[in-house]
Interface confidence: medium
């Protein structure tokens, strides 16, 4: 069966300066390929986190994604700013040249509240 990307929260609210977790789990690790988080959709979407060796300031993975059986690709965004508001999508790709997007979560909207 086709892999599903599950983002159970429709939205989260976080105060500026605090941290928030965006939950994402997969039903399978197959087909082989990376998982990436984006803010927004379409051409203008912004890469927020990739579960690779890249470094993303203020964004960390919640679980150990290097473990073979891990299906949790949740991320934590620290020191949230008003500019972090938007809808975040957890996206599964199939490895290739280039990688092909095969499934996206339903999106989680982040609301940033003034402190």
């Amino acid at each position: 069966t086709e892999v599903k990307v599950i983002q159970p929260e429709k939205s989260v609210s976080v105060a500026a300066g605090d941290s928030t977790v965006l939950n994402c789990t997969l039903t399978s690790l197959l087909p082989v390929g990376p998982i990436r988080w984006y803010r927004g959709v379409g051409q203008s979407r912004q890469l927020i986190y990739s579960f690779t060796t890249e470094h993303f300031p203020r964004v960390t993975n919640v679980s150990d994604a290097t473990k073979r059986s891990n299906l949790d690709f949740s991320i934590r965004i620290s020191n949230v700013t008003p500019e972090d508001a938007g809808t975040y999508y957890c996206v599964k790709f199939q490895r290739g040249s280039p990688d092909t997007e095969i499934q996206s979560g339903g999106g989680t909207e982040v609301y940033v509240l003034a402190k």
């Epitope: 599903k4 599950i6 983002q7 159970p8 929260e9 429709k10 939205s11 989260v12 039903t27 979560g105 339903g106």
Partner: antibody, heavy 119, light 108 residues
């Protein structure tokens, strides 16, 4: 207080159409995703369809896909379900249900409207 | 699609007794599970969300527990108004949203 009032149910023949309405009050209608859930006589609850607050995102149960259309008019605080090509198995009480703003469970429900499909 | 199985189908008890209703999921839904009460001629009512959090205005005799695939709704001491049908619903997976088949709690 949140109020959801369904209307438009009735008795129709197989193949005919019906449009259900749900008038909402007591909350900011456009900010909430809305659903239709049905219950056939003597059966359990079955989710039918979902529409996001803006109306941009829509889902249907496989059993109604291609026959039912969900829509909303945020200026009138009203949710609709257009039901075409009705079948005997669509006979049920149809509930309008307001989703929680963070998760897909239902905070508030209407009393329902009965749709009977019979020849 | 996540299938929810409720047991027993019917529970026959006396007022004052403890009722234990079970909901099993075909795959993990973590704690993304809600319970509803339905009475004839009334709108369904949200009782529990997040597997164990009581909704606003729900008496503390109602409690929920469990995570993953096994969930329980407990009514500690049945009152006359608690005799009804109870449904679980998972909201972990994106639509289709699924309900259990229901458990009817009836008076002995």
């Amino acid at each position: 207080d949140v109020q959801l009032v369904e209307s438009g149910g009735g008795v129709v023949r197989p193949g005919e159409s019906l449009r259900l309405s749900c008038a909402a009050s007591g909350f900011t209608f456009s900010s909430y995703d809305m659903n239709w859930v049905r219950q056939a006589p003597g059966e359990g609850l079955e989710w039918v369809s979902l529409i996001s607050g803006s109306g941009e995102i829509i889902y249907y149960a496989d059993s109604v896909k291609g026959r039912f259309t969900i829509s909303r008019d945020n200026s009138k605080n009203t949710l609709y379900l257009q039901m075409n090509s009705l079948r005997a198995e669509d006979t049920a009480v149809y509930y309008c249900a307001k989703e929680n703003n963070r998760y897909r469970f239902f905070d508030d429900w209407g009393l329902g409207t009965l749709v009977t499909v019979s020849s | 699609e996540t299938v929810l199985t409720q047991s027993p189908g019917t529970l026959t008890l006396s007022p004052g007794e403890r009722a234990t209703l079970t909901c099993r999921a075909s795959q993990s839904v973590y704690t993304y599970l809600a319970w509803y009460q339905e009475k004839p001629g009334q709108a369904p009512r949200l009782l529990i969300y997040g597997a164990s959090s009581r909704a606003t205005g729900i008496p503390d005799r109602f409690s929920g527990s469990g995570s993953g695939t096994e969930f329980t709704l407990t009514i500690s001491s049945l009152q006359s108004e608690d005799f009804a049908v109870y449904y679980c619903q998972q909201y972990y997976d994106r639509p289709p949203l699924t309900f259990g088949g229901g458990t009817k709690v009836e008076i002995k």
